[in-house]
């Protein structure tokens, strides 16, 4: 898979492949995988990809199901890169406060907050 | 501060306090703090709260600025609790795939993805 494929296109293709291979993937009815119990997905990327690893190890590879797992691995690579970018630039307090305000604003409007 | 205050109200109050104390907080013009370079804030909670810790250690405490940092500490507690909930329940593959599909769907529509 060329890693040059834009991440947005990669995500779209992965969604389609996930749908295509769902029946094959759920064939293992005894397997248990940690599933987050809230919808703030970005907080749970580590567990999601651990689960993907568990699923991959239990799935017969070949054909486009292999492409699905390759895509997921590229998405993980992208997310790991984003996580690295969290701490790379040490700036002035002013810029940090802008980001903190933005973060709290997003938390206020977009997060699914349980009481 | 009563921890019983709903998190959503806590976030709103914290945004207001942040605005109120901005001048005091930026008084330290030389301090360097990691500022994430993308807007997928949830991926960067660790760095955000490390930055808050650095800022707190450099800020003269007292009055409502102390309340600001107490609030931020409660928000961290809430997020840490959410992170714990990422791996608490082990479910069937079916449920995991539902969550994965939802995650990729959110990534597809809501994430700010750079090429």
């Amino acid at each position: 898979i060329p890693t040059e494929i834009p991440t947005s296109a990669l995500v779209k293709e992965t969604l389609a492949l996930l749908s295509t291979h769902r029946t094959l993937l759920i064939a293992n009815e005894t397997l248990r995988i940690p599933v987050p119990v809230h919808k703030n997905h970005q907080l749970c990327t580590e567990e999601i990809f651990q689960g993907i690893g568990t699923l991959e190890s239990q799935t017969v590879q070949g054909g486009t199901v292999e492409r699905l797992f390759k895509n997921l691995s590229l998405i993980k690579k992208y997310i790991d890169g984003q996580k690295k970018k969290c701490g790379e630039e040490r700036r002035r307090v002013n810029q940090f406060l802008d980001y903190l305000q933005e973060f709290l604003g997003v938390m206020n409007t977009e997060w699914i907050i349980e009481s | 501060i009563p921890t019983e205050i709903p998190t959503s109200a806590l976030v709103k109050e914290t945004l207001a306090l942040l605005s109120t104390h901005r001048t005091l907080l930026i008084a330290n013009e030389t301090l360097r703090i990691p500022v994430p370079v993308h807007k997928n804030h949830q991926l960067c909670t660790e760095e955000i709260f490390q930055g808050i810790g650095t800022l707190e250690s450099q800020t003269v405490q007292g009055g409502t600025v102390e309340r600001l940092f107490k609030n931020l500490s409660l928000i961290k507690k809430y997020i840490d609790g959410q992170k714990k909930k990422c791996g608490e329940e082990r479910r069937r593959v079916n449920q995991f795939l539902d969550y994965l599909q939802e995650f990729l769907g959110v990534m597809n529509t809501e994430w700010i993805i750079e090429s």
Epitope: E88, E89, R92 | E29, T30, R32, V37, Q50, T54
Partner: antibody
Framework: PGLVAPSQSLSITCTVS????????VHWVRQPPGKGLEWLGV???????DYNSALMSRLSISKDNSKSQVFLKLNSLQTDDAAMYYC?????????????WGQGTTLTVSS | SSLSVSAGEKVTMSCKSS????????????LAWYQQKPGQPPKLLIY???TRESGVPDRFTGSGSGTDFTLTISSVQAEDLAVYYC?????????FGSGTELEIK
Amino acid sequence: PGLVAPSQSLSITCTVSGFSLTSYSVHWVRQPPGKGLEWLGVIWASGGTDYNSALMSRLSISKDNSKSQVFLKLNSLQTDDAAMYYCARDPPFSLLRLDFWGQGTTLTVSS
Amino acid sequence: SSLSVSAGEKVTMSCKSSQSLLNSGNQKNYLAWYQQKPGQPPKLLIYGASTRESGVPDRFTGSGSGTDFTLTISSVQAEDLAVYYCQNDHSFPFTFGSGTELEIK
């Protein structure tokens, strides 16, 4: 630039190769003849800038990622701006690490 | 300041900061060391107070915490003739120390 008259402006271009300016930050440092090093400012990989407050009103740093070029502009030159001007690469890392330096550009300020 | 030593000797140079360069949150010390040989640009030796840059000989060691830091050359070689600068990485601006000139006897 070599020789520049007082009150004029200095413009230096630092052209990089082997890495991308979208991933690496670039700092500017100067060194007057026979003296020590002075940090001037930085343009971060993200495009943000930070300057030495002593020069903030006269200094601007910009870049063109596609051309792999970083630009320094210093206005209202004074004789004590005479120095060797270096650009230096800072890898994407939370610790400052100026791991590659240019050979430098000499500036003489004289009327 | 300047130091004059013979080849093979151990040398230590110090760098003192007016403020602590230690981040209590992550226990990192924000200080770098550079070597500048005559007619050349500076070269990075140490970052994070004690991490040796790749390719730098292991005779160079950085140590210290808070406000007091040291660069040690365990066995000075003729090619170590240079000026050594420390640089603050904790806060703006990223000030350099005044430099220590190392002379070889």
